[in-house]
């Protein structure tokens, strides 16, 4: 029997430096968790106590933080490759800066295989392209050999900005010929390393012939076997065992998110390269476990620069930016506008000539709005102010919902108005109307949403029947703010883009700012 | 800079083994693999094996299997490969190549000449 | 294991001239072709790996193309320096394959 060792991490999303236990700034550094200094020690430990290791990154290493804003990709290349990664999946997010953006900061200045399978290149793209990233690659490990096959959400170019050169093709379609093709040249130990969400893993462990690991990203996945060592709660056991349809145990594994965890799976393979056993958990990479003083020395150094970004102007505003929250829990505000519109514009996406775009809808708590700018600052506003409105390091996702959950959801916002609580709704695409003079559970008198099927758009009622797409924090996607129906009836959820780089792109793009409160939350009283 | 020092020439009669040195320096010995590649007078290229420094882990061309042996010293940053039961065809040069991060050869020694002869 | 064909075995250029040697693989091989230039008594010296990524301190005349089974080293302006053999090989599974080499001789 021949032992591996798979290290691996996914959705790190620009976790650079340690964090506090929810992902969000250290404050604390006595109880702060991850990071590449911390995560560096604990992988150079097990690579000298075990004979054949192997670490490998499932995806969506860019985006998160203001170390992706400022770098855009060239720091996910320098640590990983002072980490020595042996390979890595593309994620959605991988084309958040578009295709160049993944090209010149990462793909071309990796030292280790970047991967997936699914993604073809056509046109002009298809030469600038080739050899930067590949479908698989085979790693000498000890005195055998593994193929490692990537793949990547083919949601992405609803997700991402991959332009219309790439086609990403179904995961198990694109990846059976890949598997075959590396069976037939004798590599019978094959691990699929990629990025479609752990649904798709399992798909993919149990549908693809050959397959005998599945390391898988995309829907931040904790698995765990025993009493968990922090918050999340396990999905299932670790590995998680998916029975093919051809009879064979494949193990599937993902570690949450945010270099939180480093996922650690010993698999034993008998001689024809079958798995005989796995077993394994994600190691919590908490402040028992020291920072690398050299990679840690590095960080400070990279660091110097995000220090300088954060108090360079973005754009102006020349309307007060009204984040108060006597405005934003109360009423329509023009700071919950500007932000909803902000993510509307993140997700333009013209992949479809029926559609205009993909997606209209926005909602975003009024409790998530911290912090007012003011104006009269000369009219500046620099990501110091917007890390002020959005100081929890969230995201902006995009998800599908039935009407009838979008009117429960609107429904929640006023339950207990007038308490000034954080679940009052702002809005972009939605028009909206209350009566507080019913009773809580019936208060949403007028819901029109608009129309993304639409050479114009325009306003429509709500249907309850209908699945739409809304754009909201990953807080409210979540359950958060009593939002439980949102995280309950859900139909489909990808994690989105760093809040404040989502902010801040729209006031650099748009360069002078004057969001308006416009009717689209209004208040009735009687019949309507 | 990235230098790779082979052991100097060897004339051995068939059935004989041979061992081969390659000291590497320039690099941190254990981040790279390292190749070993042998040719023929007046012939092409031909790739014998790989071993990871590591881990002292190989790959063999099945072609030499039984035959070869690669092996480390990680004090001396020194990568060994011995071949057993010689013969006329195995006269050659035998070359060790580093390989970069994509397991592709970079840089070559100088090369090692071996002649089996009776 | 995976055949490797290189064409032509010799050619005869002048200097100044533009010289490609094709190398083609029984199968896909995946980008992952690299090519070698050999002075005679001399070990080789890597120019490409990736089918197309030149290492460092390697004249910007050579150049490489291909992907798939097709690949292909380009000489763009021949130098008398460049008087050498030239090898590929893929290494993409184990066993790595060379191709038979080329040898470019100045008219």
């Known amino acids: 029997a021949w032992e591996l060792t798979i290290l691996h991490t996914n959705d790190v999303h620009s976790r650079l430096e340690q964090t506090s236990e929810d992902s969000s700034k250290c404050v604390n550094a006595s109880r702060c968790m991850g990071g590449v200094a911390r995560l560096f020690t604990k992988v150079q430990q097990i690579r000298r106590a075990e004979p054949n290791v192997l670490l490998l990154d499932a995806g969506d290493q860019y985006q998160g933080t203001i170390w992706f804003t400022v770098y855009k990709g060239a720091e996910v290349a320098h640590f990983m490759n002072a980490l020595r990664y042996d390979a890595m999946a593309l994620g959605n997010h991988e084309f958040d800066n578009g295709v160049e953006g993944l090209i010149e900061p990462l793909l071309k200045e990796a030292k280790f295989p970047i991967l997936s399978a699914n993604i073809k290149a056509k046109g002009p793209l298809a030469s600038q392209i080739s050899g930067l990233y590949l479908p698989y690659k085979v790693l000498p490990v000890g005195d055998e050999v593994v193929g490692i096959v990537g793949y990547t959400s083919k949601e992405t170019p609803f997700l991402s900005n991959p332009g219309t050169n790439l086609v990403f093709e179904d995961e198990i379609t694109a990846l059976q010929p890949e598997v075959d093709k590396l069976k037939t040249l004798n590599v019978n130990k094959i691990i699929a390393l990629g990025h479609s969400g752990f649904e798709m893993d399992k798909l993919i462990a149990q549908k693809v012939r050959g397959v005998d690991v599945v390391v898988g990203g995309h829907s931040n996945t904790f698995l765990y076997t025993g009493n968990p060592p922090s918050k999340e709660v396990p999905a299932g056991k670790y590995p998680f065992i998916v029975t093919s349809d051809d009879g064979r145990k494949v193990p599937v594994v993902q570690a949450y998110a945010f270099g939180k965890y480093l996922g650690y799976l010993k698999i034993e393979f008998d001689e024809r390269g079958n798995v005989i056993s796995s077993h394994g958990n994600p190691i919590l990479l908490n402040s028992s476990i020291p920072e690398d003083p050299s990679i840690k020395a590095d960080i400070n150094k990279w660091r110097i620069k995000l220090d300088n970004y954060s108090t360079q102007e973005l754009g102006k505003t020349i309307v007060y930016l009204d984040g108060s929250s006597q405005s934003c829990r109360f009423r329509e505000c023009n700071m919950g506008n500007l932000i909803c519109d902000a993510m509307i514009n993140n997700n333009l996406r013209h992949t479809d000539e029926m559609f205009w775009n993909h997606v209209s809808m926005c909602i975003l708590n009024g409790g998530g709005i911290r912090s007012p700018i003011d104006e009269r600052n000369n009219g500046t506003i620099t990501w110091e102010n917007l890390a002020a409105v959005l100081p929890f390091g969230g995201t902006f996702d995009l998800v599908q919902l039935k009407g009838s959950t979008l009117k429960k959801a609107f429904e929640h916002s006023v339950h207990r108005y007038g308490q000034s609580t954080g679940e009052f709704l702002q809005v972009g695409g939605i028009h909206v109307v209350y009566d507080l003079s019913r009773k809580p559970g019936d208060r949403v008198v007028k819901l029109d949403v608009l129309c993304t099927k639409c050479r114009v758009p325009s306003y429509d009622p709500l249907k309850m029947d209908e699945v739409y797409k809304v754009i909201l924090p990953n807080f409210l996607a979540n359950g958060g703010d009593g939002f439980q129906m949102i995280k309950d009836e859900l139909l489909r959820h990808d994690s989105g883009d760093q809040d404040i780089n989502v902010v801040s792109t729209y006031i650099s793009k748009m360069k002078v700012i004057y969001p308006a409160v416009e009717g689209r939350i209004k208040f009735s009283t009687g019949s309507h | 800079q990235v230098q790779m020092k082979e052991s100097g020439a060897e004339v051995k009669k068939p059935g004989a083994s041979v061992k081969v040195s390659c000291k590497a320096s320039g690099y941190t010995f254990t981040d790279s693999n390292m190749d070993w590649v042998r040719q023929a007078p007046g012939q092409g290229l031909e790739w014998m094996g790989d071993?990871?420094?590591?881990?002292?882990?190989?790959i063999y061309n099945q072609k030499f299997k039984g035959r070869v042996t690669m092996t480390i010293d990680t004090s001396t940053s020194t990568v060994y490969m011995e071949l057993s039961s010689l013969r006329s065809e195995d006269t050659a040069v035998y070359y060790c190549?580093?390989?970069?991060?994509?397991?592709?050869?970079?840089?070559w020694g100088q090369g090692t000449l071996v002649t089996v002869s009776s | 294991d995976i055949q490797v064909t290189q064409s032509p075995s010799f050619l005869s250029a002048s200097v100044g001239d533009r010289v490609t040697i094709t190398c083609k693989a029984s199968?896909?091989?995946?980008?992952?072709l690299s090519w070698y230039q050999q002075k005679p008594g001399k070990a080789p010296k890597t120019l490409i790996y990736r089918a197309n990524r030149l290492i460092d301190g390697v004249p910007s005349r050579f150049s490489g193309s291909g992907s798939g089974t097709d690949f292909t080293l380009t000489i763009s302006s021949l130098q008398y320096e460049d008087m050498a053999t030239y090898y590929c090989?893929?290494?993409?599974?184990?066993?790595?394959?060379f191709g038979g080499g080329t040898k470019v001789e100045i008219k």
């Open positions: 190549a580093r390989t970069n991060w994509d397991y592709a050869m970079d840089y």
């Open positions: 199968q896909d091989i995946n980008s992952q």
């Open positions: 090989l893929q290494y993409d599974v184990f066993p790595r394959t």
């Open positions: 071993i990871n420094p590591n881990n002292g882990g190989t």
